[in-house]
C-alpha cells in the first residue's frame, strides 16, 4: 500500500502481481531520491481509482513497464 509521507518512501508493501495495461489509469515511476533509496512504481487502476505499489524487481512488473512504454511510443508522433 502507498502512504502519503513527505520524507519517506511512499510504498509500505509491494505487489508482484501482474497488472493488465488496459486496466491502468496511470503509472507513476518515482526515481530514487534523498528521501527514498529505491525506485517506486505506483499503479492507479481505472476501477475505483485503486492504487497499488508494484515490485520493480518482479518479472511481471518489468514486462508491464515494457508494454506501457511500447504503447506510449506507438502513440507519440
Amino acid at each position: 500500500i502507498p502512504l502519503s509521507r513527505t520524507v519517506r518512501c511512499t510504498c509500505i508493501s509491494i505487489s508482484n502481481q501482474p497488472v493488465n495495461p488496459r486496466s491502468l489509469e496511470k503509472l507513476e515511476i518515482i526515481p530514487p531520491s534523498q528521501f527514498c533509496p529505491h525506485v517506486e512504481i505506483i499503479a492507479t487502476m481505472k476501477k475505483k481509482g485503486e492504487k497499488r505499489c508494484l515490485n520493480p524487481e518482479s518479472k511481471a512488473i518489468k514486462n508491464l513497464l515494457k508494454a506501457v512504454s511500447k504503447e506510449r511510443s506507438k502513440r507519440s508522433p
Epitope: 500500500i1 502512504l3 509521507r5 519517506r8 518512501c9 508493501s13 509491494i14 485503486e50 505499489c53
Partner: antibody
C-alpha cells in the same frame, strides 16, 4: 500455508525490557509491510507500530513512541518488537499482522495467534 | 488523530436476524481506508471488509460494508451461529496512527 507465529512474551517488571519475535512463512515476507497490534485484557484492539517492506519506514502509536522499536530481518522472515521502559499499561496480548499488498489499503489480512506480555512487580 | 466511534456497544439478536453495525469517524475518512474485523473469544481478529465495501478472501456474502465520509456500516444479512463475536472498524488514513473503533459485541438474544 500463510502463517505468522509470535514468541517472546512473558512476565516482566516495570521499567524492564522484552523483545517479541514474529516468524513468517508461506508468503513473500520481504514484499509486505508488517504491523504490531495489541489487546489489553478485556479491552479492544490498539495499533502499536508498522514497518515497511524494506525496513525504511517505521511508524508508532504515541503511547509507545520512544520506548518501542519495530524492526525486521527479511533474510530470516522475522519481525521484531523491542519494548523498553515497560509499564503496567503495556500488559496485553501482542499480535503481528501482515499488511496486504494487493491494493491501496486492503487491511491486515493475516494475523498471528498472539503472545502475552504481563508487566507486573 | 481520527477517532472512531462504534454503535451500539452491544447488539443482542437471534440467529437468522439482520445485524447493522455503525462506525463513525471524527473526520472524513477515504472509503479506501476503512476496514472491518471480526474477533471471537481467544482468537486473533479476522479481516472481513476492506475499502469500506469489498469482502476479503473467503468471507461469505452475508457480510457487506457500505458508507463514505464519516459514516460507515457493516451489515450481516442473516446471522449464523458462528457470527456472534466482536466487530471492529479500523481506519488507515494517509498517515498513522491507524486507529480501531472500540468494537461492537454481537451476542445471542
Amino acid at each position: 500455508q500463510v502463517q505468522l507465529v509470535e514468541s517472546g512474551g512473558g512476565v516482566v517488571q516495570p521499567g524492564r525490557s522484552l523483545r517479541l519475535s514474529c516468524a513468517a512463512s508461506g508468503f513473500t515476507f520481504s514484499n509486505c509491510g508488517m504491523h504490531w497490534v495489541r489487546q489489553a485484557p478485556g479491552k479492544g484492539l490498539e495499533w502499536v507500530a508498522l514497518i515497511g517492506f524494506d525496513g525504511i519506514n517505521e511508524y508508532y502509536a504515541d503511547s509507545v513512541k520512544g520506548r518501542f522499536t519495530i524492526s525486521r530481518d527479511n533474510s530470516k522472515n522475522t519481525l521484531y518488537l523491542q519494548m523498553n521502559s515497560l509499564r503496567a499499561e503495556d500488559t496485553a496480548v501482542y499480535y503481528c499482522a501482515r499488511d496486504w499488498p494487493e491494493g491501496y489499503y486492503n487491511g491486515m489480512d493475516v494475523w498471528g495467534q498472539g503472545t502475552t506480555v504481563t508487566v507486573s512487580s | 488523530e481520527i477517532v472512531l466511534t462504534q454503535s451500539p456497544g452491544t447488539l443482542s439478536l437471534s440467529p437468522g436476524e439482520r445485524a447493522t453495525l455503525s462506525c463513525r469517524a471524527s473526520q472524513s475518512v477515504s472509503s479506501s481506508y476503512l476496514a472491518w474485523y471480526q474477533q471471537k473469544p481467544g482468537q486473533a481478529p479476522r479481516l472481513l471488509i476492506y475499502g469500506a465495501s469489498s469482502r476479503a478472501t473467503g468471507i461469505p456474502d452475508r457480510f457487506s460494508g457500505s458508507g463514505s465520509g464519516t459514516d460507515f456500516t457493516l451489515t450481516i444479512s442473516r446471522l449464523e451461529p458462528e457470527d456472534f463475536a466482536v466487530y471492529y472498524c479500523q481506519q488507515y488514513g494517509s498517515s498513522p496512527p491507524f486507529t480501531f473503533g472500540p468494537g461492537t459485541k454481537v451476542d445471542i438474544k
